[in-house]
Structure formats: structure tokens, C-alpha cells
């Protein structure tokens, strides 16, 4: 969490941002909040990006003002106009690209004063893994698949019964480049699986960590998966 304050002269206002990550090809949110103002027409929101000459986005007098927007963001940005009045200056970024990563500044002017805060935005690809029993294999085998990751992640297997065991010798992981030549499909196979155990396939890069669990008993198979973005800190 980054909290920024305005500088001397007129009054300053508090602006708060949260570091976040964007999934390539999907829409992302750059979070920013500020001390609200009672009049929408008095609020100016400007988003800047380090290394970019023009503005990322500008909202003033109750509407978008995009005449000075940098071309790399053209048609891809929006604020939540109905939430500006309550102090939400968050930016929606459409079709996130790898090059959108970097340092952004949320700059706010209201009738009370001005303030700004920086935000680190990471970009990559991350997806939920799915773990299944591989019935094609000759022995009891689990297959963990996740369709889109970037940068290349690490894959680690763990089990509830054999806690602390190293499964690297009995697993095999491959990365297959997807058609857009950036993201990759992750496939990991775990051999010599025992019944009545819960196995976890953990996929992690510097942006996200995802886990796919599978509980294998004689009578049933239960699956669960979750994904967590790393390093989301507020400013």
C-alpha cells in the first residue's frame, strides 16, 4: 500500500494505491483511492506512467479528457465514473499487454488540494491448474495442467501424507508455447501415486502462485484449486 500526500503550497490530500498485477490479454485494474470531494466537477484524475510522454488517462469535470492521452493507451482505459465522487480513481486497463508493466502515478486534484501516489504494476500470465488422474498411464499417475503462464513458472508437487518429500525425481514438467508466442501451457505429471492421499501441484512465478489439489481415495476423487497474486502491497 502506498500513501502519497500533496506538496506544500495549497492543501494536500491523501491518495492511496495498491501494487497489482495484470493478466496478459485480459482486463486489469490499477487501484487508487483519494479523499472524496462533494462536487464531481472539482475532481481531476490523471494517470501517468514512467517512461511514457503522454498521459495514460485524464478525467476532469465529470468526464474523460483524452486529448493528451499517449497513443499506447488509446481506447484501452476507463475510470469508474460513477465511483469517482466517493473517492475511487481506479483505472480499468483493457487487453493488458506485457509492456504495460511499470510504475504508474495516480495524481488527484480536488477543491481541497492535490496529492499523488505511485503504483507498481506487473504484467504476466497466470491461470488455475487442474489436477486429474491420468488413466492413460501404466501406473497411478496425476496430471496437472494450467493453460497460460508467463514468465516461466516453477512447478512443485507436495503430498499430505509424505510432508516434506521431494517429488522432483518422480515428476516431469513441460512448458509448451501458446499460439501468441508469449504465454505457455504448463503440464506436470506425477508418477507412483498412492491411494488415500491428497496431492498438491503448486505453480509459481514472480506474479502469481496457484495450487491445484486432488484427494484420491478408493471411493472418490475431490479437486480444489486456488490462485493468489503475489506482492500486492498498498502505497
Amino acid at each position: 500500500l502506498i500513501i502519497g500526500f500533496g506538496i506544500s503550497g495549497r492543501h494536500s490530500i491523501t491518495v492511496t494505491t495498491v501494487a497489482s498485477a495484470g493478466n496478459i490479454g485480459e482486463d486489469g485494474i490499477l487501484s487508487c483511492t483519494f479523499e472524496p470531494d462533494i462536487k464531481l466537477s472539482d475532481i481531476v484524475i490523471q494517470w501517468l506512467k514512467e517512461g511514457v510522454l503522454g498521459l495514460v488517462h485524464e478525467f476532469k469535470e465529470g468526464k474523460d479528457e483524452l486529448s493528451e492521452q499517449d497513443e499506447m493507451f488509446r481506447g484501452r482505459t476507463a475510470v469508474f465514473a460513477d465511483q469517482v465522487i466517493v473517492g475511487n480513481a481506479s483505472l480499468r486497463l483493457k487487453n493488458v499487454q506485457l509492456t504495460d508493466a511499470g510504475t504508474y502515478k495516480c495524481y488527484i486534484i480536488t477543491s481541497k488540494g492535490k496529492g499523488n501516489a505511485n503504483l507498481e504494476y506487473k504484467t504476466g500470465a497466470f491461470s488455475m491448474p487442474e489436477v486429474n488422474v491420468d488413466y492413460n498411464a501404466s501406473s497411478e499417475t496425476l496430471r496437472c495442467e494450467a493453460p497460460r503462464w508467463f514468465p516461466q513458472p516453477t512447478v512443485v508437487w507436495a503430498s499430505q501424507v509424505d510432508q516434506g518429500a521431494n517429488f522432483s525425481e518422480v515428476s516431469n514438467t513441460s512448458f509448451e508455447l501458446n499460439s501468441e508466442n508469449v504465454t505457455m501451457k504448463v503440464v506436470s505429471v506425477l508418477y507412483n501415486v498412492t491411494i488415500n492421499n491428497t496431492y498438491s501441484c503448486m505453480i509459481e512465478n514472480d506474479i502469481a502462485k496457484a495450487t491445484g489439489d486432488i484427494k484420491v481415495t478408493e471411493s472418490e476423487i475431490k479437486r480444489r484449486s486456488h490462485l493468489q497474486l503475489l506482492n500486492s502491497k498498498a502505497s
Epitope: 506538496i7 506544500s8 503550497g9 490523471q46 501517468l48 503522454g54 498521459l55 493528451e68 495524481y107
Partner: antibody
Framework: QIQLVHSGPELKKPGETVKISCKAS????????MNWVKQAPGKGLKWMGW????????TYADDFKGRFAFSLETSASTAYLQINNLKNEDTATYFC??????????WGTGTTVTVSS | DVVMTQTPLSLPVSLGDQASISCRSS???????????LHWYLQKPGQSPKLLIY???NRFSGVPDRFSGSGSGTDFTLKIRRVEAEDLGVYFC?????????FGGGTKLEIK
């Protein structure tokens, strides 16, 4: 198109005063701090300080405290540098430069000031 | 004040060659926030300076990938992979970690 356009060259005598302008266009003037940089003939660059274009508060580097003054005409998106009691060593090209984050991403065209008796 | 020392003062190169400019600071440029605010500017003859590289290694918008920056702490390098005629001019390193912000003395890149 983002640009900073300076006033023309100045020829002054020692003891006189000069006021240089820097007009900004193509971006919201009060969002970015305006810096001033001195370049003496055949020499490197020296940061003089900056002015907060929102509040109008100037900050001067130690070597430029006293005879130097930064000011604004916000309605005209213009920053000014005034040098009082000119000395021969003030002969230089002066640049305004837009501060974005921690660097100068747009520089003015520069104004050459010559001080000679 | 932080003193920025550039070497060489003058760098004669042939077009198509690689050029390398060194910049050394009198104290570490690592800010308390973890960032290193070392930048490179190019001033072509008769023009104002232009930003090339910010924060050690980040190319500014529109700067060709022939230009790359590296280094840490007090030692930094700018490399130009294949020098073109439009690259000629004076290169300045600059720090904005410590106030006052300071510049190196410049390195003149010229044709051999």
C-alpha cells in the same frame, strides 16, 4: 504535441536583469514540475532548481539562491526564470525541463543569455 | 553534492561499431526506496538534451533498442550497439537520488 518553447536570445550588461520565458503546450501544465538547467559555453549541465507548477512554490539549488527567481503564469502555461544583477559568469544557455517522475522527459528549446560590458 | 564522473571525455567511433560510456558517482545512487535514479541524456549539436535511459536500464518511449544501460551502486554504463550517424552528440549521465540533482561532464561521441 508536447513542447516547451523559450523566448529569444538576450544580450545584457553586467548589473542588468533578464527574464526568460518557457511556454508549455500539449500537456496539463500544473501536473508536472518545471525545472531550470544552466549550460555555460562548452560546459556541462547544472540543475538550478524547480518550481511546483500547482502551488507556485520554488526550490533553488544552493548555487542559485539569491539572484535567481522562478515564477509562473499558469493561465498561459508559462514558466519564467529571472536573473537579477547579471554577472559575466551568467553567460549561458538556460533550459526549462519538465520533470516527470524522477527525470526530465521534455526539455525546452533553450535561451542563450550573453552578459558583456 | 554528488559528483558524476564520465569517461571518456571524447569517444571516436566508426559507424556500425559499438560504443560504451562509463559514469561513476561519488556516492551510492541507491535511494532509500530501493530504486536507483541514474539517467542518460543525449544532446545533439545545437539542440536541447533528450532523455534516453531512466533508472539505470529503462529505455524511454521511442528510444531505439540499440541503446542499453546497466550498472549499480556507483558504477554505470551506457552502450550503443551499432552506432548510427544520428547518435552523434554529447551524452550526459545524471542522478536524481540526492538533492541537488547533478550531471556528468559529458562524453562526446564523434566519427573516427
Amino acid at each position: 504535441q508536447i513542447q516547451l518553447v523559450h523566448s529569444g536570445p538576450e544580450l545584457k550588461k553586467p548589473g542588468e536583469t533578464v527574464k526568460i520565458s518557457c511556454k508549455a503546450s500539449g500537456y496539463p501544465f500544473t501536473t508536472y514540475g518545471m525545472n531550470w538547467v544552466k549550460q555555460a559555453p562548452g560546459k556541462g549541465l547544472k540543475w538550478m532548481g524547480w518550481i511546483d507548477t500547482y502551488s507556485g512554490v520554488p526550490t533553488y539549488a544552493d548555487d542559485f539562491k539569491g539572484r535567481f527567481a522562478f515564477s509562473l503564469e499558469t493561465s498561459a502555461s508559462t514558466a519564467y526564470l529571472q536573473i537579477n544583477n547579471l554577472k559575466n559568469e551568467d553567460t549561458a544557455t538556460y533550459f526549462c525541463a519538465r520533470r516527470s517522475f524522477w527525470y526530465f522527459d521534455v526539455w525546452g528549446t533553450g535561451t542563450t543569455v550573453t552578459v558583456s560590458s | 553534492d554528488v559528483v558524476m564522473t564520465q569517461t571518456p571525455l571524447s569517444l571516436p567511433v566508426s559507424l556500425g561499431d559499438q560504443a560504451s560510456i562509463s559514469c561513476r558517482s561519488s556516492q551510492s545512487l541507491v535511494h532509500s526506496n530501493g530504486n536507483t535514479y541514474l539517467h542518460w541524456y543525449l544532446q545533439k549539436p545545437g539542440q536541447s538534451p533528450k532523455l534516453l535511459i531512466y533508472k539505470v536500464s529503462n529505455r524511454f518511449s521511442g528510444v531505439p533498442d540499440r541503446f542499453s544501460g546497466s550498472g549499480s551502486g556507483t558504477d554505470f554504463t551506457l552502450k550503443i550497439r551499432r552506432v548510427e550517424a544520428e547518435d552523434l552528440g554529447v551524452y550526459f549521465c545524471s542522478q536524481s537520488t540526492h538533492v541537488p540533482w547533478t550531471f556528468g561532464g559529458g562524453t562526446k561521441l564523434e566519427i573516427k
